[in-house]
């Protein structure tokens, strides 16, 4: 009854209250969850179902093609990143249901909530790699003919994963379990030992490397790609544009609330009303960011249907056509079918 793994009575309704009715008996039953937490739970449930099934299907489709198709390598890695993040969802879901009580211990606290950040960095770095690949296919076709191969693609993915792990370390290191005396609750969160400068530094690095810099570089990158594609009168350029916008936008739209609240909280005092309000929205922001983990398969399916009219084809068959179509490099006038042309754009997964 006295270890971290015990179920505490719930006194959540005493949070934030300084004036209490002295005659009211202590209610040890579970009180209702806040609206943001309920919304977060709904999103987590949907993301888990769609994310696990969708990404498992993408992994299954691309794994067989990864030896010979470079696009399959990209999508396989993105799907693995998303799938891994989805595995943490049942634990995060359970914690929210228990009013953020964390009965899973210190190791789980360090690892599981860090998975979404690993996903963010892995996805954005893989996206950068894929975008570079797209850029080279359009602007350096001869180089691609000579050097672009599966081996190099796997090396690039390994580098992306390595960097992602490196960038996730601060979150991993500063995550701790804190057992609060009243109301009795074990919480899992980041603790910078009241070092606001360190907290701000981590938040700024996360914002810049995980959001602002990719937003700038990818916008420039795809602007050039699309301009070149249009100038070559690519047959499906408008559809391509829609897919590229959907893919790139999904990452930045769904990460925006998390990044904004994160940077704000790092500059606010923990006892300030704004901080406390943002903290109540934290689960919702995390769940919103988690949508990235299930959006890719949806985009692939929609893109496959839109481009190929394959509504009557089986889902694996449709995905195979979208995800494993190899890029064609044509002599001096390069024109790529897979990439700028097909859905190969979901370079941006998280």
């Amino acid at each position: 009854m006295d270890s971290f793994n015990y179920t505490t009575p719930d006194y959540g309704h005493y949070d934030d209250k300084d004036t209490l009715d002295l005659n009211t008996p202590v209610d040890k039953t579970s009180n209702t969850l806040r609206v943001p937490d309920i919304l977060a739970l709904v999103i987590f449930a949907v993301v888990f179902l769609v994310g696990v099934l969708g990404n498992a299907l993408v992994v299954w489709v691309t794994a067989f093609e990864a030896k010979r198709t470079i696009n399959a390598i990209w999508f396989l890695n993105l799907a693995v990143a998303d799938f891994l993040s989805c595995l943490a969802l049942p634990i995060l879901f359970t914690s929210i249901v228990q009013h953020h009580h964390w009965p899973f211990g210190g190791a789980a606290c360090s690892i599981l909530p860090s998975l979404i950040l690993l996903n963010m960095y892995a996805s954005i770095l893989l996206l950068a790699t894929i975008s570079a690949d797209r850029f080279l296919l359009v602007f350096k076709p001869i180089w691609c003919q000579n050097f672009r191969g599966a081996g190099l693609a796997w090396i690039a993915c390994a580098v992306a994963w390595g960097l992602a792990l490196l960038l996730t370390i601060p979150s991993f290191l500063y995550r701790v379990v804190r057992e609060e005396y009243f109301p009795p609750k074990v919480l899992c969160g980041v603790d910078y030992s009241h070092d606001k400068r360190r907290e701000r530094a981590v938040a700024i690095v996360r914002l810049v490397l995980g959001f602002l810099w990719p937003l700038l570089t990818l916008t420039i990158c795809y602007t050039f790609i699309l301009l070149r594609t249009w100038s070559r009168r690519a047959t499906r350029s408008t559809k391509t544009l829609k897919v590229v916008v959907a893919v790139v936008a999904s990452f930045f739209i769904f990460w925006l609330p998390y990044q904004v609240t994160g940077i704000m909280m790092s500059f606010l005092e923990p006892s300030s009303p704004t901080f406390l309000l943002l903290k109540k929205l934290d689960s919702l922001c995390v769940s919103f960011a988690y949508i990235n983990c299930c959006i890719n398969p949806i985009i692939y399916v929609v893109a496959g249907q839109g481009f190929q009219g394959r509504l009557r084809k089986s889902l694996p068959s449709l995905l195979r056509n979208v995800l494993t179509e190899e890029s064609v490099v044509r002599e001096s006038k390069s024109f790529t079918r897979s990439t700028v042309d097909t859905m190969a754009q979901k370079t941006q997964a998280v």
Partner: antibody, heavy 121, light 112 residues
Framework: QVQLQQSGPELVKPGASVKISCKAS????????MNWVKQRPGKGLEWIGR????????KYNGKFKGKATLTADKSSSTAYMQLSSLTSEDSAVYFC??????????????WGQGTTLTVSS | DVVMTQSPLSLPVSLGNQASISCRSS???????????LHWYLQKPGQSPKLLIY???NRFSGVPDRFSGSGSGTDFSLKISRVEAEDLGVYFC?????????FGAGTKLELK
Amino acid sequence: QVQLQQSGPELVKPGASVKISCKASGYAFSNSWMNWVKQRPGKGLEWIGRIYPGDGDTKYNGKFKGKATLTADKSSSTAYMQLSSLTSEDSAVYFCARFLLISTVTAVDYWGQGTTLTVSS
Amino acid sequence: DVVMTQSPLSLPVSLGNQASISCRSSQSLVHSNGNTYLHWYLQKPGQSPKLLIYKVSNRFSGVPDRFSGSGSGTDFSLKISRVEAEDLGVYFCSQSTLVPLTFGAGTKLELK
């Protein structure tokens, strides 16, 4: 008014056990946590643990697990702490102290007068 | 465990003068609900501790207004504006934000 009346001083032999009592009055015993605190000269105050008399729910300081056992009797509004396998290190003054759950104070506010335990052969 | 470090350990004062005691915690004492559960107690020889200040700056019932508490996060202080004879004793800071509850080593307020 709030009162926490503790049992008298104890002189016990090493290896033995002892049970200290703390009788509460002047407030709703079941709407509180009863905390136990150890004080040794030059060692400051150490929190042993707490009990919720309403249902016997306990929480211990890791340092005192296996050493202290907390119980409570709602009918007599009395909290108990049993200390086992006593050594000279257990010689100290032991306080019971309440934490009222329904309160604006949210602190350990009232303390018993203390029970002196001497472990000696 | 949260380590509470008090200074000074001994504070000689003259009656009527101001006294100030500092308390620093090894971790932030801000609770998830925004409150900071840092308290101050006075223990006189042969007696049990008495609550003076709760939640950093709130005076407990019956505590004179010459006692005041301040601070945030990890740094806190207790001030006695004009020390009286009845104020002499050992002052402890304590936190009830996290388990286990922990106490400072104490500051002995004594006459010069």
